[in-house]
């Protein structure tokens, strides 16, 4: 039977794969020379462990979990990655001033294990 993609974290609250908001400066990101910003930025990222069948994205992830338990040295555990993204607009520095550019894959919107 196909395993359920569980949302219960057996490691305790907040320890498993989920969306986090991380604050950073443009210097932290290495973007100071090409992005204009008056203050620190916020970025949403997927962080956390992927135990058992927690938020397994697909059958492949479920198989990976099972095989990791059997052969941890050969098969890595699933990774916590974005399932979808939110767009974000960057104000970019150009030779003639500044311009807007929308990036569709910059902010994680929700997360799963794969």
């Amino acid at each position: 039977a196909r395993a359920r993609n569980g949302d219960h974290c057996p490691l305790g609250p907040g320890r498993c794969c989920r969306l986090h908001t991380v604050r950073a400066s443009l210097e932290d990101l290495g973007w100071a020379d090409w992005v204009l910003s008056p203050r620190e930025v916020q970025v949403t990222m997927c962080i956390g462990a992927c135990p058992s069948q927690f938020r397994a994205a697909n059958m492949h992830a479920q198989i990976k979990t099972s095989l990791h338990r059997l052969k941890p040295d050969t098969v890595p555990a699933p990774c916590c990655v974005p399932a979808s993204y939110n767009p974000m607009v960057l104000i970019q520095k150009t030779r003639t001033g500044v311009s807007l550019q929308t990036y569709d894959d910059l902010l994680a919107k929700d997360c799963h294990c794969i």
Epitope: L19, T21, V35, V41, Q42, N86, P87, V89, I91, K109
Partner: antibody, heavy 123, light 108 residues
Framework: QVQLVQSGAEVKKPGSSVKVSCKAS????????VSWVRQAPGQGLEWMGG????????NYAQKFQGRVTITADESTSTAYMELSSLRSEDTAVYYC????????????????WGQGTLVTVSS | SYELTQPLSVSVALGQTARITCSGD??????VSWYQQKPGQAPVLVIY???NRPSGIPERFSGSNSGNTATLTISRAQAGDEADYYC??????????FGGGTKLTVLG
């Protein structure tokens, strides 16, 4: 089609508070930034602050810091603006406005607006 | 805090070109948006990032921005263009700033 529908007109006494709602439909609520902009009778536009549901935190214009609270309920795709210690100068039309998330700047480029809510402060 | 200055009113003859200015210190290095507001209605975004138009805004609307002045240009002005126009950018801490607004009157 994106729509922002605001709550109805309010009449308030000086010193009281008002809470205005803004319900979004036709788009992904958490993927955008929602601001509140007010316009006193015969006057210009004034940005009060805004919230990005995916970040969860609000930013406020210095003028309104401590007097305004902006919140969002993702489950109902609704943003709220509460203004306290009302005075007659707060009589205005209050608009919610939606825009993309702008890195660092966060708010602006308001491509969709609510219909406005008239708040009258009078004793 | 950053200030944007607009003329209170601008008049243009029907079919002619209207230019509405927005002055601010080194505004040429800012992103500037323009909004149109008709009486009793909510504002509408007409121009952003120099001269980009949202869908539904006619090509007659264009923008430019350099030095200390941003300009909204409305060519072949029509009676329906009569409205208040506001410029918008950000101050040094990222707060949204609007100009005081300009009332456009189309004559004839």
């Amino acid at each position: 089609q994106v729509q922002l529908v605001q709550s109805g007109a309010e009449v308030k006494k000086p010193g009281s508070s008002v809470k205005v709602s803004c319900k979004a439909s036709g788009g992904t609520f958490r993927s955008y930034a929602v601001s509140w902009v007010r316009q006193a009778p015969g006057q210009g536009l004034e940005w009060m602050g805004g919230i990005i549901p995916i970040f969860g935190t609000a930013n406020y214009a210095q003028k309104f810091q401590g007097r305004v609270t902006i919140t969002a309920d993702e489950s109902t795709s609704t943003a709220y603006m509460e203004l306290s210690s009302l005075r007659s100068e707060d009589t205005a039309v209050y608009y919610c406005a939606r825009g993309p998330i702008i890195m660092g700047y966060q708010f602006g480029l308001f491509d969709h607006w609510g219909q406005g809510t008239l708040v009258t402060v009078s004793s | 805090s950053y200030e944007l200055t607009q003329p209170l009113s601008v008049s243009v003859a029907l079919g002619q070109t209207a230019r509405i200015t927005c002055s601010g210190d080194n505004i040429g290095s800012h992103i500037v948006s323009w909004y149109q507001q008709k009486p009793g209605q909510a504002p509408v975004l007409v121009i952003y990032d120099k001269s980009n138009r949202p869908s539904g805004i006619p090509e007659r609307f264009s923008g430019s921005n350099s030095g200390n002045t941003a300009t909204l240009t409305i060519s072949r002005a029509q009676a329906g263009d009569e409205a208040d126009y506001y410029c918008q950018t950000w101050d040094s801490i990222g707060s949204v700033v609007f100009g005081g607004g300009t009332k456009l009157t189309v004559l004839g």
